[in-house]
């Protein structure tokens, strides 16, 4: 399989393009969160259903025919590498929690009378630090919905409420997959609160909204994309474990024009250490909280993963001996808070400079729509991917 970095970047960008078709405003999701959930489902699927999900973890360069020829046993062995990679990644992520509020939570809610294979129950815990939760869909569908919602709420510091609306769960539901990613990080260098000012954010050339614009001037990883007329800036979080990358077009309405010119491979290339250089930057970044939730069955089906969500095509025989099991619902929800908080600059460390427009200072003024993503630097995996276009 490809590295988690490559896979999450590819899924992030492909999913963004899919979500963009039906979303005009902010788009925000966790590629790696969604991938862990797909991995959990892959663990329990077989046949064509598994093959479709497995495609996500392989680049197009690997010929499909060579994998299709593989015996089922070989396919299962190949997917073992996928699950082991997640096990390693989730273990690494869990070590960051002293410095960040970062939770990647997966849970499968299963009908309480349905029989699941013990191997699946064991492995989902082993590889994904996740569990199945029994709920009474048959006799108490709405009560089950409320139970799931309150669990989600508790896991997201009450930021995500009513993930499942009225009527979204029925007595025939057997399996619901919920993936949540919650993040509140501290910057490697704080933004001084006293420098934050109210400012206009231009959603397009004629419409603006007020935002609290944070400001700092410092050395940052920077690159200018001449052909796209856009800038990319890397902003490190505490200990440099994670970084936020902002892709800001020069023009107010430039984002739409350049999206088709971006590819996952280019994003990786542009943000690689060899491509970016340390520059003095005057940075203006809105303070924002984004919380978004998506019902992903239709979106993933459009991306070629439809069998897993189809009652008649799904093969979940690695999860259950019974027939008719499939994930009726796959909900993904993510939350990130972008605030001034960071490591307070100690007197002797990193030299800051006052905000000026002196020559040699790059200006990155995020007051119009931009793309951003947050990367786990050790694995190069994309924790979050988003478009900020509407405060």
């Amino acid at each position: 399989m490809d590295s988690l970095g490559a896979v999450s970047t590819r899924l992030g960008f492909d999913l963004f393009k899919e979500l963009k078709k039906t979303n005009d405003g902010n788009i925000f999701f966790s590629p790696v969160g969604i991938l862990t959930a797909i991995g959990m489902v892959l663990l329990g699927t077989r046949g064509a259903t598994a093959s479709q999900l497995e495609e996500v973890f392989h680049s197009e360069k690997e010929t499909k025919s060579s994998r299709i020829k593989a015996e089922e046993k070989e396919v299962i062995e190949n997917t073992e590498a996928v699950h082991q990679q997640f096990q390693k990644f989730l273990t690494e992520i869990s070590k960051l929690t002293n410095d960040y509020e970062l939770n990647i939570t997966n849970r499968l809610f299963g009908e309480k009378t349905y029989l699941f294979l013990q191997k699946y129950l064991d492995y989902v815990e082993k590889y994904y630090h996740a569990s199945l939760e029994p709920v009474d869909f048959v006799n108490a569908a709405d009560e089950s919905r409320k139970k799931i919602n309150s669990w989600v709420e508790s896991k997201t510091n009450e930021k995500i409420k009513d993930l499942f609306p009225d009527g979204s769960i029925s007595s025939s539901t057997k399996l619901v997959l919920v993936n949540m990613v919650y993040f509140k990080g501290q910057w490697d260098r704080e933004f001084k609160k006293e420098n934050t000012k109210e400012e206009k954010f231009w959603m397009n050339k004629s419409t603006s909204k007020s935002v609290q614009m944070m400001t700092q001037s410092h050395s940052f990883s920077f690159t200018f994309l001449e052909d796209l007329q856009a800038k990319i800036l890397g902003i490190p979080y505490k200990n440099n474990d994670l970084s936020m990358f902002v892709l800001l077009p020069n023009d107010i309405d430039g984002l739409e024009k350049i999206i088709d010119k971006i590819s996952p491979e280019k994003l990786v290339e542009w943000t690689s250490p060899g491509h970016m250089e340390e520059r003095k930057v005057n940075l203006h970044l809105p303070r924002f909280e984004v919380e978004d939730g998506y019902d992903l069955e239709a979106v993933l089906a459009a991306m070629g993963m439809g069998d897993a969500f189809s009652e008649h095509k799904a093969d979940y025989s690695g999860m259950s001996s019974g027939s008719g099991l499939y994930a009726q619902k796959f909900l993904h929800s993510s939350f990130v808070a972008v605030t001034e908080e960071g490591t307070e600059a100690a007197a002797a460390t990193g030299i800051g400079f006052t905000v000026t427009s002196a020559p040699g200072h790059e200006n990155v003024h995020c007051n119009h729509p931009f793309l951003f993503f947050i990367r786990h630097n050790e694995s190069n995996s994309i924790l979050f991917f988003g478009r900020f276009s509407s405060p």
Partner: antibody, heavy 129, light 112 residues
Framework: QVQLQESGGGVVQPGRSLRLSCAAS????????MHWVRQAPGKGLEWVAV????????YYADSVKGRFTISRDNSKNTLYLQMNSLRAEDTAVYYC??????????????????????WGQGTLVTVSS | DVVMTQSPLSLPVTPGEPASISCRSR???????????LGWYLQKPGQSPQLLIY???IRASGIPDRFSGSGSGTDFTLKISRVEAEDVGVYYC?????????FGQGTKLEIK
């Protein structure tokens, strides 16, 4: 489709040993717990033993504990029952059966392998001098 | 070991008529997770047994809806709403709460 075929039965003298095999096909054998159940001629059913999908957990009926050993070879899709110190009362048709699965959160039950389906056709073991 | 007792041991039934088999356990089969660990198996003449009902009331895959299970704790019942000729055989209840799993003596259902 799922098939289970027992073999290795026959006539054996008391105190001797016998090994039964159960060849599985039509499903991913390594994902399932497996059971042995026996039925003495003209009598009812008696559960004998269960083994987890990876062979790490085994449980036995008191009547066979210390004499019988359940094992599996996942690479060969085969379940075994090694029967030592056989007695006349061990005479029975021996069935292997696949476990059906567990409800979620079975913590507290002695084993999550609770239901057997399907069953093989059985192999007859006769212990007689 | 948990002792299971079935009644009747023999049950002659006219086709199309209902039938009912009772099963009692010496100790409660209700687990703290809310499930009753009681199953019903049918062994047709000359065949291997097959699972009909698990968790006291859940029909196994492919089992016709004329079969239903009920009960909780120590008292359980298997009902056949309209007996058909193919339903003949020996019906066993089994506790699956703890090993060793134990079966009832069996109830022989025959057509009148």
């Amino acid at each position: 489709q799922v098939q289970l075929q027992e073999s290795g039965g026959g006539v054996v003298q008391p105190g001797r040993s016998l090994r039964l095999s159960c060849a599985a096909s039509g499903f991913t054998f390594s994902s399932y717990g497996m059971h042995w159940v026996r039925q003495a001629p003209g009598k009812g059913l008696e559960w004998v033993a269960v083994i987890s999908y990876d062979g790490s957990n085994k449980y036995y009926a008191d009547s066979v504990k210390g004499r019988f050993t359940i094992s599996r070879d996942n690479s060969k899709n085969t379940l075994y029952l090694q029967m030592n110190s056989l007695r006349a009362e061990d005479t029975a048709v021996y069935y292997c059966a696949r476990d059906l699965g567990a409800v979620i959160a079975v913590a507290g039950t002695s084993t999550p392998y609770n239901w057997f389906d399907p069953w093989g056709q059985g192999t007859l073991v006769t212990v007689s001098s | 070991d948990v002792v299971m007792t079935q009644s009747p041991l023999s049950l002659p039934v006219t086709p199309g008529e209902p039938a009912s088999i009772s099963c009692r356990s010496r100790q409660s089969l209700l687990h703290s997770n809310g499930h009753n660990y009681l199953g019903w198996y049918l062994q047709k003449p000359g065949q291997s047994p097959q699972l009909l009902i698990y968790l006291a009331s859940i029909r196994a895959s492919g089992i016709p809806d004329r079969f239903s299970g009920s009960g909780s704790g120590t008292d359980f019942t298997l009902k056949i709403s309209r007996v058909e000729a193919e339903d003949v055989g020996v019906y066993y209840c089994m506790q699956a709460l703890q090993t060793p799993y134990t079966f009832g003596q069996g109830t022989k259902l025959e057509i009148k």
